[in-house]
Interface confidence: low
């Protein structure tokens, strides 16, 4: 008997051909001998099967001796042996309908698990193989699981179901909900305005949820909520904000925060969390602020950085156009009795300057000037 594989929700066409190339009487029945449809002259007649309005044929083909059974919006329970009775002969077609669905939702948070579940008719023993957008192959039986979804897993997953040497292909679009960057670092001189941006790595028509920025200042013993906000249809509204620092927040996406000025007491690490409506779990982005300050106090020229710097970062003090007077893998460097001129404080990583602050040292009878 012929085997045809179908996809849940799709349309399938089961063929039935008579030797005579003309319109003759035919009937399609299911394995319980319940009539699905047939003809009476040029009219299509329907039986009492549960397929009812989902079953159809192509009248235009009857004159050629073709009497297809079309089943729309396939359901798993449509899996059955369908019998076409025409010219005193019976043609049997076994229809197996499969469905492949993602566990709950196709929009999943980064780090969550994706479970693809195969719905299959009783008695079938299909195998499934799926290929992720980044080319990773997974295979399994009734369920396939991928843990710890990453941003690169966003896109179309192609899954092939194999049964009776026949295959049917499913395409499932998966959106991994995440920020574009897991972590970012901002380097600022003391007093400068600080811009934090949290671009999302996905686009959806309506985005609703709530978020909060928790901040752990390097100098503080505990973390503090700097701002809480709501997101409704991509519009941002601030719910609560600390008085110090008084952050400003953009009203549109991407999420954008402005710190009025960089100060040593603000240097540290923040964690922005975003809870999306109808989603369990939260999106996270870490943000770090490094603040530099250069000062001259009496005969001491000091350069300091605050915030999360890596041990390989180099802090230097040098007179303009001269070799560095002092360079250390430390968070503070100083020069005693500095020469008059424009001094530069540099924070660098493998020769690349991340942050620079200039301070003018005047001859000893004057006070220093910071440009």
């Amino acid at each position: 008997k012929k085997v045809v594989l179908g996809k849940k929700g799709d349309t399938v066409e089961l063929t039935c051909t008579a030797s005579q190339k003309k319109s003759i009487q035919f009937h399609w029945k299911n394995s319980n001998q319940i009539k699905i449809l047939g003809n009476q002259g040029s009219f299509l007649t329907k039986g009492p099967s549960k397929l009812n309005d989902r079953a159809d044929s192509r009248r235009s083909l009857w004159d050629q001796g073709n009497f297809p059974l079309i089943i729309k919006n396939l359901k798993i329970e449509d899996s059955d042996t369908y019998i076409c009775e025409v010219e005193d002969q019976k043609e049997e077609v076994q229809l197996l309908v499969f469905g492949l669905t993602a566990n709950s939702d196709t929009h999943l948070l980064q780090g969550q698990s994706l479970t693809l579940t195969l719905e299959s008719p009783p008695g079938s023993s299909p195998s499934v193989q799926c290929r992720s957008p980044r080319g990773k192959n997974i295979q399994g039986g009734k369920t396939l699981s991928v843990s710890q979804l990453e941003l690169q897993d966003s896109g179309t997953w192609t899954c092939t179901v194999l049964q009776n040497q026949k295959k049917v292909e499913f395409k499932i679009d998966i959106v991994v909900l995440a920020f574009q960057k897991a972590s970012s670092i901002v380097y600022k001189k003391e007093g400068e305005q600080v811009e934090f941006s949290f671009p999302l790595a996905f686009t959806v028509e309506k985005l609703t949820g709530s978020g909060e920025l928790w901040w752990q200042a390097e100098r503080a013993s505990s973390s503090k909520s700097w701002i809480t906000f709501d997101l409704k249809n991509k519009e941002v509204s601030v719910k609560r904000v600390t008085q110090d620092p008084k952050l400003q927040m953009g009203k549109k996406l991407p999420l954008h925060l402005t710190l009025p000025q960089a100060l040593p007491q603000y240097a540290g690490s923040g964690n922005l969390t975003l809870a999306l409506e109808a989603k369990t779990g939260k999106l996270h982005q870490e943000v770090n602020l490094v603040v530099m300050r250069a000062t001259q106090l009496q005969k001491n020229l000091t350069c300091e950085v605050w915030g999360p710097t890596s041990p390989k970062l180099m802090l230097s003090l040098k007179l303009e156009n001269k070799e560095a007077k002092v360079s250390k893998r430390e968070k503070a460097v100083w020069v005693l009795n500095p020469e008059a001129g424009m001094w530069q404080c540099l924070l660098s990583d493998s020769g690349q300057v991340l942050l620079e602050s200039n301070i003018k040292v005047l001859p000893t009878w004057s006070t220093p000037v910071q440009p």
Epitope: K46, P48, K50, N52, D53, R54, E119, S120, P122, K142
Partner: antibody, heavy 118, light 111 residues
Framework: QVQLVQSGAEVKKPGASVKVSCKAS????????IHWVKQATGQGLEWIGE????????YSNAKFKDRVTITADKSTNTAYMELRSLRSDDTAVYFC???????????WGQGTLVTVSS | DIVLTQSPASLAVSPGQRATITCKAG??????????MNWYQQKPGQPPKLLIY???NLESGIPSRFSGSGSGTDFTLTINPVEENDTATYYC?????????FGPGTKVEIK
């Protein structure tokens, strides 16, 4: 949003017939089966039958089969349940219901009280 | 026909406590790994409200205080913790085969 709105209360004499309507909105009427459920005063729930509005195919509980006719009018998005040869034990609230995404009845009409009294 | 029996017929629980209702089916309502049992809550003058479908799936908008478990012929609805407004009658219903059937109901009263 999905809504099922039923016709108003009816008082009927024994032996008469009653036809209760259920108007659907907020979804494609032909995509979902409409079920009918009976609840006698202070009693439990009893499934009467169902209709596939797209085709008019109806299935009913054998207990009601001879006396019930379930129909649907696609043009008005309305399902009907007609109960004939009414008896006093037909006095009940009749609900129409629709499945949600799962297998349970997630959407219900407000109910129609049918009183059979001489 | 599949007959459903519920126990207890009525139950009085204090707020904050756990309420457990069981439903026994005359035959298994399992199919291909799923159990076709649903649970409803009904308050006087209102239509039933779906709480749980396919034995353990929480219907959208229903608090997680409600949970369902079981397979085959034995099923349980648990409310933990119970709140004042949980006073209602609770019904199990099999959607495994026609005729669809409901249990006789369990009346839950909050002390």
């Amino acid at each position: 949003q999905v809504q099922l709105v039923q016709s108003g209360a009816e008082v009927k004499k024994p032996g008469a017939s009653v036809k209760v309507s259920c108007k659907a909105s907020g979804y494609t009427f032909t995509d979902y089966v409409i079920h009918w459920v009976k609840q006698a005063t202070g009693q439990g729930l009893e499934w009467i039958g169902e209709i596939y509005p797209g085709s008019g195919s109806a299935y009913s509980n054998a207990k009601f089969k001879d006396r019930v006719t379930i129909t649907a009018d696609k043009s008005t998005n309305t399902a009907y349940m007609e109960l004939r040869s009414l008896r006093s034990d037909d006095t009940a609230v009749y609900f129409c219901a629709r499945r949600g995404n799962g297998t349970g009845f997630a959407y219900w009409g407000q109910g129609t009280l049918v009183t059979v009294s001489s | 026909d599949i007959v459903l029996t519920q126990s207890p017929a009525s139950l009085a629980v204090s707020p904050g406590q756990r309420a457990t209702i069981t439903c026994k089916a005359g035959q298994s309502v399992d199919y291909d790994g799923d159990s076709y049992m649903n649970w409803y809550q009904q308050k006087p003058g209102q239509p039933p409200k779906l709480l749980i479908y396919v034995a353990s799936n929480l219907e959208s908008g229903i608090p997680s205080r409600f949970s369902g478990s079981g397979s085959g012929t034995d099923f349980t609805l648990t409310i933990n913790p119970v709140e004042e407004n949980d006073t209602a009658t609770y019904y199990c219903q099999q959607s495994y085969k026609d005729p669809l059937a409901f249990g006789p109901g369990t009346k839950v009263e909050i002390k």
